[in-house]
Amino acid sequence: MRTEAQVPALQPPEPGLEGAMGHRTLVLPWVLLTLCVTAGTPEVWVQVRMEATELSSFTIRCGFLGSGSISLVTVSWGGPNGAGGTTLAVLHPERGIRQWAPARQARWETQSSISLILEGSGASSPCANTTFCCKFASFPEGSWEACGSLPPSSDPGLSAPPTPAPILRADLAGILGVSGVLLFGCVYLLHLLRRHKHRPAPRLQPSRTSPQAPRARAWAPSQASQAALHVPYATINTSCRPATLDTAHPHGGPSWWASLPTHAAHRPQGPAAWASTPIPARGSFVSVENGLYAQAGERPPHTGPGLTLFPDPRGPRAMEGPLGVR
């Protein structure tokens, strides 16, 4: 069991923006508003980010560190999915994505990581101390869930400093101690602030976002040394319980996709979707829902009137090619 504060690795500044410090000016508040406490498993990482532009808007990013075939990802808030949590989104690798307010956009980032943007206004909007959980169902690894949240004091000045250390796999958890990483981050942050102080105030420009190729295992937490905590989740008591959502599967059994028409199963392949992420061949246990049942010993799902899906053209294994032997 591990507990870690996870912040993203800083990207090197873009050369063109270095002079005006535009990139760093944008990165700094974003980084300061990023803090995540993940507990429960070394196999799943969760990152909760409060947007610097909209302080009531959240981005949740989750990833699975196993190498098996992911069959479902469930994002919930207010606690783990099966223990009082309310489902925000369900992402199925072949049958698409289902989301519920206040979830604004759920999508696959890589074949083993997802992101979810939460709407920031209204009665059901999240608040700083809400706990978000991600559950990955994979074979042969099983179901793995981890939870994260912004601390109640999500004031930019109080957030943990970033760690510029490279992304680490969970297995290498003991290499860097938390103190060392935080110290390094503090020094780096002070260095940035100092440089910022000695420069003329830059003119604000509209941020230009360059689409980044999805990286497998991106944003994996650089973990703290293994804590001997035998607590399944670090659930922070939240004073702002989410409003009741229109969940089609309130008991955690995602039956909404069990009755989908088969034509809804394949997601359209976006232009050059996943071209930058080579999809590894999977073993015989992979079950791509239409056409490859024999390899996984799977039966086709029942057809019938299904729910409307929001297919994600950037699906991780949309129309996967021939399967290799693991």
């Epitope: 074979f139 099983g142 179901s143 039956s255």
Partner: antibody
Framework: EVQLVESGGGLVKPGGSLKLSCAAS????????LSWVRQTPEKRLEWVAT????????YYSDNEKGRFTISRDNAKNNLYLQMSHLKSEDTAIYYC????????????WGQGTLVTVSA | QVILTQSPAIMSASLGERVTMTCSAS???????FHWFQQKPGSSPKLWIY???NLASGVPPRFSGSGSGTSYSLTISSMEAEDAATYYC?????????FGAGTKLELK
């Protein structure tokens, strides 16, 4: 309290068929993956098959693929294992198991049902 | 297929004695997907230690688990009569899911 109760075992001739059932209670059945694990007379444990909570994902051991079919009825809280073309090597106690998040596939076990394949 | 080899196959220990049994995997297994089960005669197996070192609910603290890669072990710091049972190791890092043949622990 999680309860898994297997039934349907018995004596069957080689080449014959048998359908095992597992009645579950004490938890939200539709929210968990279920498996069949068997224990041979030599006391070896062998994984047979697994079915995801929704029921559309199924996984089999190589030895059983094509002969066995795992299925579930979420409305009735029942898990099934349809076995055909049975061999003497299939003689075992068959256990129904339930998974748990962050704990693996076989967190909870039923009491088992004995299947004997013999002429 | 990951083959799990448990040793010894049978062992006996006196009350209060420290007991260690091992499980060796034919290829590397992530510690998260490695577990131990306890089975007593006439009963079903029970999850005993999950993810290498975490004790399942109701397991006495005299039990501990450790290991990584291809080598794992279960230790009882002080043998008690109720610990006499067969212990199986299990991995679900790779398909098919496999179990060791078991270590039968008897009370001397």
């Amino acid at each position: 309290e999680v309860q898994l109760v297997e039934s349907g075992g018995g004596l069957v001739k080689p080449g014959g068929s048998l359908k095992l059932s597992c009645a579950a209670s004490g938890f939200t059945f539709s929210g968990y993956a279920l498996s069949w694990v068997r224990q041979t007379p030599e006391k070896r444990l062998e994984w047979v098959a697994t079915i995801r909570d929704g029921g559309s994902y199924t996984y089999y051991s190589d030895n059983e693929k094509g002969r066995f079919t795992i299925s579930r009825d979420n409305a009735k809280n029942n898990l099934y294992l349809q076995m055909s073309h049975l061999k003497s090597e299939d003689t075992a106690i068959y256990y129904c198991t339930r998974d748990q998040v962050n704990r693996g596939w076989f967190t909870y076990w039923g009491q088992g049902t004995l299947v004997t394949v013999s002429a | 297929q990951v083959i799990l080899t448990q040793s010894p196959a049978i062992m006996s220990a006196s009350l209060g004695e420290r007991v260690t049994m091992t499980c060796s995997a034919s290829s590397s297994v992530s510690s998260s997907y490695f577990h131990w089960f306890q089975q007593k005669p006439g009963s079903s197996p029970k999850l005993w230690i999950y993810s290498t070192s975490n004790l399942a609910s109701g397991v006495p603290p005299r039990f501990s688990g450790s290991g990584s890669g291809t080598s794992y072990s279960l230790t009882i710091s002080s043998m008690e009569a109720e610990d006499a049972a067969t212990y199986y190791c299990h991995q679900h890092h790779r398909s098919p899911l496999t179990f060791g043949a078991g270590t039968k622990l008897e009370l001397k």
